[in-house]
């Protein structure tokens, strides 16, 4: 499942970047865009047992995800 | 989500290589869909992409030459890149990082283009 | 343009031996607190792989005797052992901003 809000804050950005919810931070363009616009991961179907494509994107330890989801662990996830 | 590059294999000097790039389990108007090439023996060189909302970067090492497009009813792009020189003989990849860290975590196979007459 | 460098050019190590891969940037691949340094496995006539992504994730389906390591322009790709399949042409890719740039690469062969 696809967290809500996020929006990205560091030394680079003069100012907190919110995102409200559904919304992704797109670093590209460098402001809020739909997360339905941004290649974000997809849960997996409760029960799917064929494996992943080759070279999906998979959380680990030090990224706070969700099943199936990779986050931002950012200092300005809000 | 499969990408699968076409297009010619052999262009002329001052021609035009054109190629496209058919994506399939998902939708172009959502994510980044760039191009790639690799020198033979080479390493890998960024061309650029086109984004969700048709926008486009082309590095600046080839921005004079480059277009990318695309056709979002046959969920395809293209990369067009004029003026060739045997210097742009090189394998062709298409590739789409994932949000949010922008990582080519989905390639094409690769189509090789040679360059000469 | 962020500059890459991947050293050694070539490591000549025996399979069941430890592999260290460097890449060095030319300015700091981090922002928002995250280092965006990828690493992938490249086979003669294949496309590249995703085996590691911000730095230290390993992508799917990605062993566990891959591991990634680093911060700032300072990276490392590290094989805790060798396996007869890893020999190949590893490259460092940053995703910080574009254009999007490669190391060169490091051959990894059989001694």
């Known amino acids: 499942m696809r967290r809500g809000p996020r929006s990205l804050r560091g030394r680079d950005a003069p100012a907190p970047t919110p995102c409200v919810p559904a919304e992704c931070f797109d670093l590209l363009v460098r402001h809020c865009v739909a997360c339905g616009l941004l290649r974000t991961p997809r849960p997996k179907p409760a029960g799917a047992s064929s494996p992943a494509p080759r070279t999906a994107l998979q959380p680990q330890e030090s990224v706070g995800a969700g099943a199936g989801e990779a986050a931002l662990p950012l200092p300005g996830l809000l | 989500v499969q990408l699968q590059e076409s297009g010619p294999g052999l262009v002329k000097p001052s021609q035009t290589l054109s190629l496209t790039c058919t994506v399939s389990g998902d939708s172009i108007t959502s994510g980044y869909w760039n191009w790639i090439r690799q020198h033979p023996g080479k390493g890998l060189e960024y061309i650029g992409y086109?984004?969700?909302?048709?926008?486009?970067y082309y590095n600046p090492s080839l921005k004079s030459r480059v277009t990318i497009s695309r056709d979002t009813s046959k969920n395809q792009y293209s990369l067009k890149l004029s003026s060739v020189t045997a210097a742009d003989t090189a394998v062709y990849y298409c590739a789409s990082p994932n949000y949010p860290f922008y990582a080519m975590d989905y390639w094409g196979q690769g189509t090789l283009v040679t360059v000469s007459s | 343009d962020i500059v890459l460098t991947q050293s050694p050019a070539t490591l000549s190590l025996s399979p069941g031996e430890r592999a260290t891969l460097s890449c060095r940037a030319s300015e700091s691949v981090d922002n928002y607190g995250i280092s965006f340094m990828n690493w992938f496995q490249q086979k003669p006539g294949q496309a590249p792989r995703l085996l590691i992504y911000a730095a230290s994730n390993r992508a799917t389906g990605i062993p566990a005797r891959f591991s990634g390591s680093g911060s700032g322009t300072d990276f490392t790709l590290t094989i805790s052992s060798l396996e007869p399949e890893d020999f190949a042409v590893y490259y460092c890719?940053?995703?910080?901003?574009?254009?999007?740039?490669f190391g060169g690469g490091t051959k990894v062969e059989i001694k």
């Open positions: 086109i984004s969700y909302s048709g926008s486009t």
């Open positions: 890719q940053q995703s910080k901003e574009v254009p999007w740039t």
